[in-house]
Interface confidence: low
């Protein structure tokens, strides 16, 4: 006859491991007992349990309550046992020794592999600001046995670097994601993906990117200077920028206070019917928690009568 077992038995931490050992004998052969022992290299054999055809199962004190026979129905030639609630320390070599009648003794070894699924953690890097250059966006760490794989899933352009720390029975892997912060990254997901044979599916932790920026400010409304003449109604200046966080706007006049009747409405400066007192240098100040920008324009309110008078002078001069 011969023994049937597995070279490797793989189990996830906390699950029950079935250690197989089946004697496939000739007709009329019987199994008297099956002895299980742990036989790691460099250490003496440590008895787990003894299955006796007459006396049943005997578990050694070190494994009391942790070794059982598989549930019935049982084949008298089956010497398999269950190791309950596998822990990392259970990983190693095991041997089953089968005593048969009349064929004698047989033995076989297997390796128990205990997978320790990782519990990943994601740590965001420092606050991201446009113009920083290559910056740490996030790091992701996962420890397990065997070493987990840590990758990144994102539409964002960036570079990754990984390092691994080996412990006695596990390994910790840390991956860092670096990027050049840009405004287009705002709201983009950066997902750490951890793969491991002890996981039914990849574990994913998502971090939403926030990049502070403030665009250059500019002022619209002065495209046609001829529209800025005495008496014109509805004249306005609009300050344009964009930023994250969204910026606030403030209007001032460089050469004095804002004239009476001029109203500030956020990014817009609205004028009453224009007079020459509205001529001056106006400054739009845009700011958010990241930065501030200024844009200034010169308003020159034209007097149509002055212009026509000049034209008359020119005509008379000719």
């Amino acid at each position: 006859g011969e023994l049937e077992t597995s070279d490797v038995v793989t189990v996830v931490l906390g699950q029950d491991a079935k250690l197989p050992c089946f004697y496939r004998g000739d007709s009329g052969e019987q199994v008297g007992q099956v002895a299980w022992a742990r036989v790691d290299a460099g250490e003496g054999a440590q008895e787990l349990a003894l299955l006796h055809s007459k006396y049943g199962l005997h578990v050694s004190p070190a494994y009391e309550g942790r070794v059982e026979q598989p549930p019935p129905p049982r084949n008298p030639l089956d010497g398999s046992v269950l190791l309950r609630n596998a822990v990392q320390a259970d990983e190693g070599e095991y041997e089953c020794r089968v005593s048969t009648f009349p064929a004698g003794s047989f033995q076989a070894r297997l390796r128990l592999r205990v997978l320790v699924p990782p519990l990943p953690s994601l740590n965001p890097g420092p606050a991201l600001e446009e113009g920083q250059g290559l910056t740490l966006a996030a790091s992701c760490t996962a420890e397990g046995s065997p070493a987990p794989s840590v990758t990144w899933d994102t539409e964002v352009k960036g570079t990754t670097s990984s390092r691994s720390f080996k412990h006695s029975r596990s390994a910790a892997v840390t991956s860092e994601f670096h990027l050049v912060p840009s405004r287009s990254m705002n709201g983009q997901p950066l997902t750490c993906v951890v793969s491991h044979p002890g996981l039914l599916q990849d574990q994913r932790i998502t971090h939403i990117l926030h990049v502070s920026f403030l665009a250059e400010a500019s002022v619209r409304g002065l495209e046609d200077q001829n529209l800025w003449h005495i008496g014109r109604e509805g004249a306005m200046l609009k300050c344009l920028s964009e930023g994250q966080p969204p910026p606030s706007y403030n209007w001032t006049r460089l050469d004095g206070p804002l004239p009476s009747g001029v109203r500030v409405d956020g990014d817009t400066l609205g004028f009453p019917p224009l007079t020459t007192e509205h001529s001056g240098i106006y400054v739009c100040h845009v700011s958010n928690e990241f930065s501030s920008r200024d844009s200034q324009v010169t308003v020159d309110v034209l007097d149509p009568q002055e212009d026509s008078g000049k034209q008359v002078d020119l005509v008379s001069a000719s």
């Epitope: 352009k157 840009s182 709201g187 344009l240 920028s241």
Partner: antibody, heavy 122, light 107 residues
């Protein structure tokens, strides 16, 4: 997968109007500036207009300023180009394109739609 | 507006050849230059950004170099699928402008 699909092209008479649409999918539309680029038959590429991510005003090529209006509806993931007072020289394939809006290397166009043909002829 | 001038306007080459296309800007544009490939009836495809950075998914036989006003696109070993028109584009200032294109044809 990033996808841009233009629609709305066709034959229109000089002086007429047309509205092009560009449906975006596969990325966060509101985070990216968008451009329209056109290509006259047998000719090279010409940038038409750009719209930012929401704060700053749009930009236009001098050749279309005052006639074309770019807009976007972030809730519908759609970019538009309203074309008025069309001329024969506006005849072209119009592409919408996503801009890689990154200060580290400016505004190039990393994804393009398949294009829609606009023909202006009497 | 910044003018972009490509040369040559067309070239004939064989599979396996090394092909070089140049692009000159009318004023300095630092590295704000992109290269695109366009096949007949298709949309342009970004090959190179920031003058020398290879866009994800583009074969490594494509490379870009240059800064300031003079730029080069090189195809180290021309493949059958590389026969197309290539455009450079500056995005240093608005409006962004394209070169007139270089058509790479089979010899």
């Amino acid at each position: 997968e990033v996808q841009l699909v233009e629609s709305g092209g066709g034959l229109v008479q000089p002086g007429g109007s047309l509205r092009l649409s560009c449906a975006a999918s596969g990325y966060i539309f509101s985070n990216y500036a968008m451009s329209w680029v056109r290509q006259a038959p047998g000719k090279g590429l010409e940038w038409v207009s750009r719209i930012s991510t929401g704060f700053a005003g749009p930009d236009y090529a001098d050749s279309v300023k005052g006639r074309f209006t770019i807009s976007r509806d972030n809730s519908k993931n759609t970019l538009y180009l309203q074309m008025n007072s069309l001329r024969a020289e506006d005849t072209a394939v119009y592409y919408c394109a996503r801009q890689t809006e990154d200060r580290s290397y400016g505004y190039d166009l990393d994804y393009w739609g398949q294009g829609t043909l606009v023909t202006v002829s009497s | 507006d910044i003018q972009m001038t490509q040369s040559p306007s067309s070239l004939s080459a064989s599979v396996g050849d090394r092909v070089t296309i140049t692009c000159r800007a009318s004023q300095g544009i630092s590295s704000y230059l992109a290269w695109y490939q366009q096949k007949p009836g298709k949309a342009p495809k970004l090959l190179i950004y920031a003058a020398s950075s290879l866009q994800s998914g583009v074969p490594s036989r494509f490379s870009g170099s240059g800064s300031g006003t003079d730029f080069t696109l090189t195809i180290s070993s021309l493949q059958p699928e590389d026969f197309a028109t290539y455009y450079c584009q500056q995005h240093y200032t608005t409006p962004p402008t394209f070169g007139q294109g270089t058509k790479v044809e089979i010899k």
